[in-house]
């Protein structure tokens, strides 16, 4: 057979589906690899072929589309399972071809078991809600295309193992779950179970996501440098170790990059000849505010080093700040004999 453009195994699209539930999987070729869609390909005379490799096997085999009740079927560029079974786990390949053209991609499909509280090895999407920010909603994800708009499914929402009813600030509204005012206690896993009929059968779709309550933009402030500050003076003798912490508090900001850095005499530590080490530690609050500490360390400080300017800088999407550390050379205590001699006017 002629050469086929093989995009390999697309591990970026590790698809996980629950056992005994419907699953519709679009061929990734049209979504991520080719510049045309299925309709264009179909009208150009290209055919989409599906096959798979079972888990722990090397042999590629065609997918059996003649199972009872059409358990596995193909519709346009979608592979359907009604429903999945545990042993459907494997690598699936979709190939688009005619006599002159061929392109294919494989992707892993994992059929996952869940317990009665919806716990499973499924990787969960995270939805961030702002704390105390007014009404915010989450929507039951990835249910489009499973049933026509004429079908009215029933949707039940759960938090963890518990059905959401009479919760203090969480209200189920069909496909949406409304948080009247999000609080830390709203952190957790939320599951929607969508139940719909099809050809005399009842199917369930289970979708779980993690809600993380984060700092509100109304509370967000520019970075705050807690150290160095005006109250602490780093007074050292030559030969001692100089340790200056730069501690910065960053409000949570969606998609903001938080940066902390030191300059010594206006230059980055990498650009100067002093033997400086910088160690960083990061801690997060319950609402994902961040405290970064960068400790500047000079093992054996010289009198020249003690004359330099040490400035801590911080930047986030809210702004940039800087603070200089107060560094000075410790004045040695006067030696008694010298002081006495001076007192008597000796030269």
């Amino acid at each position: 057979s002629e050469r086929c453009d093989d995009w390999g195994l697309d591990t970026m699209r590790q698809i996980q589906v629950f056992e005994d539930e419907p699953a519709r999987i679009k061929c990734p070729l049209f979504e991520h690899f080719l510049k045309f869609n299925y309709s264009t390909a179909h009208s150009a005379g290209l055919t989409l072929i599906w096959y798979w490799t079972r888990q722990d096997r090397d042999l590629e085999e065609p997918i059996n589309f003649r199972l009872p009740e059409n358990r596995i079927s193909k519709e346009k560029d979608v592979l359907w399972f009604r429903p999945t079974l545990l042993n459907d786990t494997g690598n699936y390949t979709c190939m688009l071809r005619n006599t002159t053209y061929c392109s294919k991609v494989a992707f892993p499909l994992e059929v996952v078991q869940k317990d009665s509280c919806f716990n499973s090895p499924m990787k969960l999407p995270v939805h961030k809600l702002y704390i105390e920010y007014g009404i915010q909603r989450i929507t039951c994800p990835n249910v489009d295309g499973y049933f026509p708009s004429s079908v009215k499914p029933t949707i039940t929402w759960y938090m963890g193992c518990y059905k959401i009813q009479n919760f203090n600030n969480v209200i189920p509204e069909g496909m949406n779950l409304s948080f009247l005012i999000a609080l830390i206690s709203n952190n957790g896993n939320y599951t929607c179970v969508v139940t719909y009929p099809e050809n005399g059968r009842t199917f369930h779709l289970t979708r779980t996501l993690t809600v993380k309550v984060v700092g509100s933009p109304k509370n967000a402030v520019p970075p705050v440098i807690h150290s160095p500050n005006d109250h602490v003076v780093y007074e050292k003798e030559p030969g001692e170790e100089l340790l200056i912490p730069c501690t910065v508090y960053f409000s949570f900001l969606m998609d903001s990059r938080n940066e902390v850095w030191w300059t010594i005499d206006g230059k980055k530590p990498d650009d100067i000849t002093i033997d400086v080490t910088i160690n960083e530690s990061i801690s997060h609050s319950r609402t994902e505010d961040e405290t970064r500490t960068q400790i500047l360390s000079i093992k054996k400080v010289t009198s020249e080093d003690l004359k330099r300017s040490y400035v801590c800088h911080a930047r986030s999407a809210k702004g940039e700040v800087a603070k200089a550390a107060k560094v000075k050379q410790k004045v040695p205590a006067p030696r008694y004999t010298v002081e006495l001699a001076c007192g008597f006017g000796a030269t």
Epitope: G160, S185, G188, T247, H284, S285
Partner: antibody
Framework: EVQLVESGGGLVQPGGSLRLSCAAS?????????MCWVRQAPGKGLELVSC????????WSASWAKGRFTISRDNSKNTLYLQMNSLRAEDTAVYFC????????????WGQGTLVTVSS | DIQMTQSPSSLSASVGDRVTITCQAS??????LAWYQQKPGQAPKLLIY???TLASGVPSRFSGSGSGTDFTLTISSLQPEDFATYYC??????????FGQGTKVVIK
């Protein structure tokens, strides 16, 4: 009315055990709250003992409480518990049950406390 | 573990006085600090959260300030019902949940 009522305190001998209860009313444990036990020895300050998220059951305990004190909850009874084993004289205190100490705001709530006396 | 140090441990003041209590955290806790008032035989009552936000129903003579490691509770004009013990509480994350040792405000 939203309230917390502790019970189960009393006199116990050193080495003995006791189980404290905190009955919650006016709100539903399954809705997920951060419930804690806080103690206060006579004439002393507040000390955090142990906390639990009522929905998931995830817990946190002070390092000194691990191994001797166990927090739990029964969501069907809307009740928080503290099982205290191998009790010592220094565990003598009023034990308070409190809600939402992880982000105290307008939802913060405390019970009136129950006295535990460990003495022979 | 984090240490929360309050000062003074006790203070005597008169009605109408301006009273200031400080709380120092052994590590930076951002704005995640609450203040409570406790009267003998009663449960603590929340006064201030997020370092400076007044809890509902708390008189405006109470105010809080600070961030990072240094925090202050101020009572602008002490009233007879304010004689009590005051506690700070850090709640930055589960590794920093702790109360200060308390400050007792007594009548001079």
């Amino acid at each position: 009315e939203v309230q917390l009522v502790e019970s189960g305190g009393g006199l116990v001998q050193p080495g003995g055990s006791l189980r404290l209860s905190c009955a919650a009313s006016g709100f539903d444990f399954s809705s997920n709250y951060y419930m804690c036990w806080v103690r206060q020895a006579p004439g002393k300050g507040l000390e955090l003992v142990s906390c639990i998220y009522t929905n998931s059951g995830n817990t946190w305990s002070a390092s000194w409480a691990k191994g001797r004190f166990t927090i739990s909850r029964d969501n069907s009874k809307n009740t928080l518990y503290l099982q205290m084993n191998s009790l010592r004289a220094e565990d003598t205190a009023v034990y308070f049950c409190a809600r939402d100490l992880n982000y105290p705001d307008t939802s913060n709530l405390w019970g009136q406390g129950t006295l535990v006396t460990v003495s022979s | 573990d984090i240490q929360m140090t309050q000062s003074p441990s006790s203070l005597s003041a008169s009605v109408g006085d301006r009273v200031t209590i400080t709380c120092q955290a052994s590590q930076s806790i951002g704005y995640y600090l609450a203040w409570y008032q406790q009267k003998p035989g009663q449960a603590p009552k929340l006064l201030i959260y997020r370092a400076s936000t007044l809890a509902s129903g708390v008189p405006s003579r109470f105010s809080g300030s600070g961030s990072g490691t240094d925090f202050t509770l101020t009572i602008s004009s002490l009233q007879p019902e304010d004689f009590a013990t005051y506690y700070c509480q850090s709640y930055y994350n589960s590794d920093s949940d702790a109360f200060g040792q308390g400050t007792k405000v007594v009548i001079k």
